[in-house]
Interface confidence: low
């Protein structure tokens, strides 16, 4: 399941990955060192009945209709770490590969 | 992240595992051989700022909040398989480990 | 370092407002979430509010909503509490303290500010 | 909301005691609790962060443990500046919930 991508001009209105850039600097989170920004991107779209699942679970889901389930949502199914260089809570500046930072495939669950 | 286990009586409305019985008979599964039915278990709840999230790049998503971003969503973030006994498509018996079958796990992402 | 400084208590009469600010200086603001704790005399510690480093996300205890507003000001680096239809039981001191959510929590208080409800 | 339970809700111990607080949580909530130390008209000093990670500049006799729902402060040589009251804080979900405060006195 290779999952969709999409940019801001699609039409596409199924579960799809949307770049995204995150700029820690807009957030002022200001004990990250770097990388000040980096490509985060993001999952958006509708589920639609048996599109994109990454589970047969959420194809069960669906059928047995328990209450409360709200049916499966678009979110990722991927996901890769990135490596930072920050300041921990003592001031000692930490260089480490952070994980679930990139989303590299959305689907639904 | 240990997630939350509720049951049909629990009044948790943030996100949570809730105890599910998928039974392949009730839904005329007649190809499956074994098991008739199993715990399969599901996700439901709202997902509240930070409450259970999976990644950092929830978080980072919210804070960003682009176009079309739905907010995390309830989703099974820990999924295990089930043995089972079936009939393929060419009608031959296959046991097999089946994944994405159990959920473990609920969380935000 | 770190420091916040309250300033906004004070006597007040059932039914009166007072609004508590908490102004932040020697780390960036606009990064953190921001709560308001409270402490009744010889009681324990009350969460009473929260809100995001963006205001986007805000939240209250029970026994505040709706009669308690927090906002912040982070061109100010400020933060604030007014408190309305005051009662009783809102006599406590008020704190003010930083978020850094995640794994960090709360790390840092202010020096708390007394406000008290009587006729 | 989630519950803390915080216990003994006070101990006499004398300087040079090992002093041990616990909290319960009413559900799982990771390791995302800290143990705070006040004073008589002071604000709140956090003295551990994470369940177990030690705030910057806290001397190294405290320390915590615990994840999910069960969580422990240990003082292991009770110092005379430590009398004091000491609560636990769950910032896992709103609302923020605090333990309801363990008070140390001097035997």
């Known amino acids: 399941n290779l999952g969709l991508d999409c940019d801001e001009h699609s039409s596409e209105s199924r579960c799809c990955r949307y770049p995204l850039t995150v700029d820690f600097e807009a957030f002022g989170w200001d004990w990250i060192i770097a990388p000040k920004r980096y490509k985060a991107n993001y999952c958006s779209g509708q589920c639609e009945y048996m599109f994109m699942q990454k589970y047969p679970h959420t194809h069960l889901v669906q059928q047995a209709n328990p209450r409360g389930s709200a049916g499966p949502c678009c979110t990722p199914t991927k996901m890769s770490p990135i490596n930072m260089l920050y300041f921990n809570d003592k001031q000692q500046i930490i260089y480490g590969k952070i994980p679930g930072m990139v989303v590299d495939r959305c689907g639904c669950s | 992240n240990l997630g939350l286990d509720c049951d049909e009586h629990s009044s948790e409305s943030r996100c949570c595992r809730y105890p599910l019985t998928v039974d392949f008979e009730a839904f005329g599964w007649d190809w499956i051989i074994a098991p008739k039915r199993y715990k399969a278990n599901y996700c439901s709840g709202q997902c509240e700022y930070m409450f259970m999230q999976k990644y950092p790049h929830t978080h980072l998503v919210q804070q960003a909040n682009p176009r079309g971003s739905a907010g995390p969503c309830c989703t099974p973030t820990k999924m295990s398989p089930i043995n089972m006994l079936y009939f393929n498509d060419k009608q031959q018996i296959i046991y097999g480990k089946i994944p994405g079958m159990v959920v473990d796990r609920c969380g935000c992402s | 370092q770190v420091q916040l400084v309250q300033s906004g208590g004070g006597l007040v009469k059932p039914g009166g407002s007072l609004r508590l600010s908490c102004a932040a200086s020697?780390?960036?603001?606009?990064?953190?979430?921001m709560n308001w704790v409270r402490q009744a005399p010889g009681k324990g510690l009350e969460w009473v509010s929260s809100?995001?480093?963006?205001?986007?996300?805000?939240y209250y205890a029970d026994s505040v909503k709706g009669r308690f507003t927090i906002s912040r000001d982070n061109a100010k680096n400020s933060l604030y509490l007014q408190m309305n239809s005051l009662r009783a039981e809102d006599t406590a001191v008020y704190y003010c303290?930083?978020?850094?959510?995640?794994?960090?929590?709360?790390?840092?208080w202010g020096q708390g500010t007394t406000v008290t409800v009587s006729s | 909301a989630i519950q803390m339970t915080q216990s003994p809700s006070s101990l006499s111990a004398s300087v040079g005691d090992r002093v041990t607080i616990t909290c319960r949580a009413s559900?799982?909530?990771?390791?995302?609790l800290g143990w705070y130390q006040q004073k008589p008209g002071k604000a709140p000093k956090r003295l551990i962060y994470?369940?177990?990670s030690l705030q910057s500049g806290v001397p190294s006799r405290f320390s915590g443990s615990g994840s999910g729902t069960e969580f422990t402060l240990t003082i292991s040589s009770l110092q005379p500046e430590d009398f004091a009251t000491y609560y636990c804080?769950?910032?896992?979900?709103?609302?923020?919930?605090f333990g309801q405060g363990t008070k140390v006195e001097i035997k």
């Open positions: 559900q799982g909530i990771r390791n995302d």
């Open positions: 804080l769950q910032h896992n979900s709103y609302p923020y919930t």
């Open positions: 020697g780390f960036t603001f606009s990064s953190y979430s």
């Open positions: 303290a930083r978020d850094r959510g995640y794994t960090f929590g709360v790390d840092y």
């Open positions: 809100i995001s480093s963006s205001s986007s996300y805000i």
């Open positions: 994470a369940a177990s």
